[in-house]
């Protein structure tokens, strides 16, 4: 008989599950790249933009060699949940300018939610703990100005792009170690 109802099902092939997560991550990366380009085209960015509430990049070239699957999946999920919150905030608070990108931002949010569900499923199949974020969630304050919300949008899309780029690399590397 199989495992009792309600217990996480251990996947017969975690590599296939990882493949599926990589595909979704790549797809979201393409969407983010396209939307970031649209943003730059519609609302040219003057220099680099940062936002204190965004997560710091979890991976770098130096850390790729020491990656472990539980840590990568947990951190990726926490970071993507933060980006999801930021995208939701942009859609509600970003002002009329960002409403012109509403279909794309809505689609990006839906894809992000789908990837998060897939990562959650992958973690439960690998019997990994569903870790909560270390830090308490800080409420996102109102943008100081319309210009400020456009700068925030550049920062959010830029940060999400980098996070997803490293996520694809990290997940592919981890797949070879499974």
């Amino acid at each position: 008989p199989g495992p009792p109802a309600g217990s996480p099902r251990v996947s017969s092939d975690p590599r296939a599950d990882l493949d599926s997560a990589v595909l979704l991550t790549r797809s979201l990366l393409a969407d983010t790249r396209q939307l970031a380009a649209q943003m730059r085209d519609k609302f040219p960015a003057d220099g680099d933009h940062s936002l204190d509430s965004l997560p710091t990049l979890a991976m770098s070239a130096g850390t790729l060699g020491s990656l472990q699957l539980p840590g990568v999946l947990t951190r990726l999920r926490v970071d993507l949940m933060s980006y999801l919150r930021h995208v939701q905030w942009l859609r509600r608070a970003g002002g009329p300018s960002l409403k012109t990108l509403e279909p794309e931002l809505g689609a990006l949010q839906a894809r992000l939610e789908r990837l998060l569900r897939r990562l959650q499923l992958l973690m439960s199949r690998l019997a990994l703990p569903q870790a909560a974020p270390d830090q308490p969630v800080i409420p996102l304050g109102p943008p100081a100005s319309a210009w400020g919300s456009i700068r925030a949008a550049h920062a959010i899309l830029g940060g999400l792009h980098l996070t997803l780029d490293w996520a694809v690399r990290g997940l592919l590397l981890l797949k070879t170690r499974l």
Epitope: K42, F43, R91, R92, A93, G94, G95, P96, S97, K99, T100, E102, P142, P143, A144, S145, A146, W147, G148, S149, I150
Partner: antibody, heavy 117, light 111 residues
Framework: QVQLVESGGGVVQPGRSLRLSCAAS????????MHWVRQAPGKGLEWVAV????????FYADSVKGRFTISRDNSKNTLYLQMNSLRAEDTAVYYC??????????WGQGTLVTVSS | QSVLTQPPSASGTPGQRVTISCSGS????????VSWYQQLPGTAPKLLIY???LRPSGVPDRFSGSKSGTSASLAISGLRSEDEADYYC???????????FGGGTKLTVLG
């Protein structure tokens, strides 16, 4: 301190045109989206139009679409509302308002437009 | 006919708590932030509440906002005679691509 001062209101005949101005001071005008909101005598508030901080994104209420044009000159810290084909129902006090997102944090004192033959 | 629905009038005695409701739909209140404005007779509107429940500096904490689903409400506690004014709710509407207002509620402070 933030100040918004509307001008250009007056009495005008139906079918004619009028241009309202809103002079802004006390803040970085080019960083904020700006709106026009109107209020007919004894009635509630009605949103008219918005223009983005850079001037390229504009939205209008259905009641004024095709007749009114919102514009801005960031070098002059001024917002405009060009009103063509005016109707009696356009009679109202017109307010300009600053917005950081979707709420109006500062309003002008308003300028009265009366459309009457 | 306003897109957001408010009661035309409300009243209370000094010291009382009064609540004004604002009902909308999924395309406005349901998916965007609500703001509230106070308009004293013969003056321009003034921002009271934004981001559903935040108060700008200078607005007394007797004023509070809340939202649930497609409805929002403004509560005024410790009612004072100077609160007698018109109150408007507002939100962006994704279907109309514009800002929508409630019809306004005239608050009368009795006695």
């Amino acid at each position: 301190q933030v100040q918004l001062v509307e001008s250009g209101g007056g009495v005008v005949q139906p079918g004619r045109s009028l241009r309202l101005s809103c002079a802004a001071s006390g803040f970085t005008f080019s960083h904020y989206d700006m709106h026009w909101v109107r209020q007919a005598p004894g009635k509630g508030l009605e949103w008219v139009a918005v223009i983005s901080y850079h001037g390229s994104v504009k939205f209008y209420a259905d009641s004024v679409k095709g007749r009114f044009t919102i514009s801005r000159d960031n070098s002059k810290n001024t917002l405009y509302l060009q009103m063509n084909s005016l109707r009696a129902e356009d009679t109202a006090v017109y307010y300009c308002a600053r917005t950081p997102g979707f709420h109006f944090d500062y309003w002008g004192q308003g300028t009265l437009v009366t459309v009457s033959s | 006919q306003s897109v957001l629905t408010q009661p035309p009038s409300a009243s209370g005695t000094p010291g009382q708590r009064v609540t004004i409701s604002c009902s909308g739909s999924s395309s406005n209140i349901g998916s965007n932030y609500v703001s509230w404005y106070q308009q004293l007779p013969g003056t321009a509107p003034k921002l009271l509440i934004y981001y559903d429940d935040l108060r700008p500096s200078g607005v007394p904490d007797r004023f509070s906002g809340s939202k649930s689903g497609t409805s929002a409400s403004l509560a005024i506690s410790g009612l004072r005679s100077e609160d007698e004014a018109d109150y408007y709710c507002s939100a962006w509407d994704d279907s109309l691509s514009g800002v929508v207002f409630g019809g306004g509620t005239k608050l009368t402070v009795l006695g």
